[in-house]
Interface confidence: low
Amino acid sequence: QLLEPCGYIYPEFPVVQRGSNFTAICVLKEACLQHYYVNASYIVWKTNHAAVPREQVTVINRTTSSVTFTDVVLPSVQLTCNILSFGQIEQNVYGVTMLSGFPPDKPTNLTCIVNEGKNMLCQWDPGRETYLETNYTLKSEWATEKFPDCQSKHGTSCMVSYMPTYYVNIEVWVEAENALGKVSSESINFDPVDKVKPT
């Protein structure tokens, strides 16, 4: 019995831009070839338990097989590399989750309001849905001093943890980042006293 996975899928953490092509490879270990009396031509690729058509599969050499997907659209696919051994007994080699989505759009329409004596709330339009875990961070600074970052919980707004100083201009912008990219909004420059919400 083998004490490790029989091989690995690369990339191990696939994140693909929706609508693009993607290729993964499965590399079998030498010990696996000998243990199961197989080579890469015995590999069966599966997505969500369904066999991938042979025309999408290429045997690169005795240890390595590749699979190519065109126009990836599903948000999440369980991709597995399997081998047919000992008279068609299927053994799972390795499995990864392939995620697809979009890089973040440049956040737009950034606006902030100040709750008198309390805090400041900034809101923005994140653009299209990314379908991926996307972190939005509100950044702010005054002259050369940086204020603490504000990590957005919902992706469209953030309540800053500090009380902004009046009568000095601060610069505020949003950074959006996921596995496919990172982008910043245009910054806005204002005196917080001008953004006080009327009570």
Epitope: E12, F13, V15, S76, Q78, G95, T97, L99, E133
Partner: nanobody, 114 residues
Framework: QVQLQESGGALVQPGGSLRLSCAAS????????MKWVRQAPGKGLEWVSS????????YYADSVKGRFTISRDNTNDTLYLQMNSLKTEDTAVYYC???????RGQGTQVTVSS
């Protein structure tokens, strides 16, 4: 801030059972496949098991198949590894990790010895 905190490791006799837990925070847990990996003394990281985001698909290394069961609770953002019929060769530090996120926890020590 992504955080993964394993617990449940212990000293256990061969043939015994343990249940490891991994509490996740700082990311949308249900979006991601999760996995357990382990590192035995003086060895490299070894993949143990993976589970899809919804929990419907599970995968195991040959060495643990039939003895270990991976599961998840997406309501409480927790990953589990039920380990039965433990063997001395299961002795290792066990880590949970999130697929597609370059993070893993600090690990929990499992020692199988008589």
């Amino acid at each position: 801030q992504v955080q993964l905190q394993e617990s449940g490791g212990a000293l256990v006799q061969p043939g015994g059972s343990l249940r490891l837990s991994c509490a996740a925070s700082g990311f949308t847990f249900s979006y991601y496949a999760m996995k357990w990996v382990r590192q035995a003394p003086g060895k490299g990281l070894e993949w143990v098991s993976s589970i899809s985001g919804g929990g419907g698909a599970t995968y195991y290394a040959d060495s643990v198949k039939g003895r270990f069961t991976i599961s998840r609770d997406n309501t409480n953002d927790t990953l589990y590894l039920q380990m039965n019929s433990l063997k001395t060769e299961d002795t290792a530090v066990y880590y949970c990790a999130a697929q597609n996120l370059d993070y893993r926890g600090q690990g929990t020590q499992v020692t199988v010895s008589s």
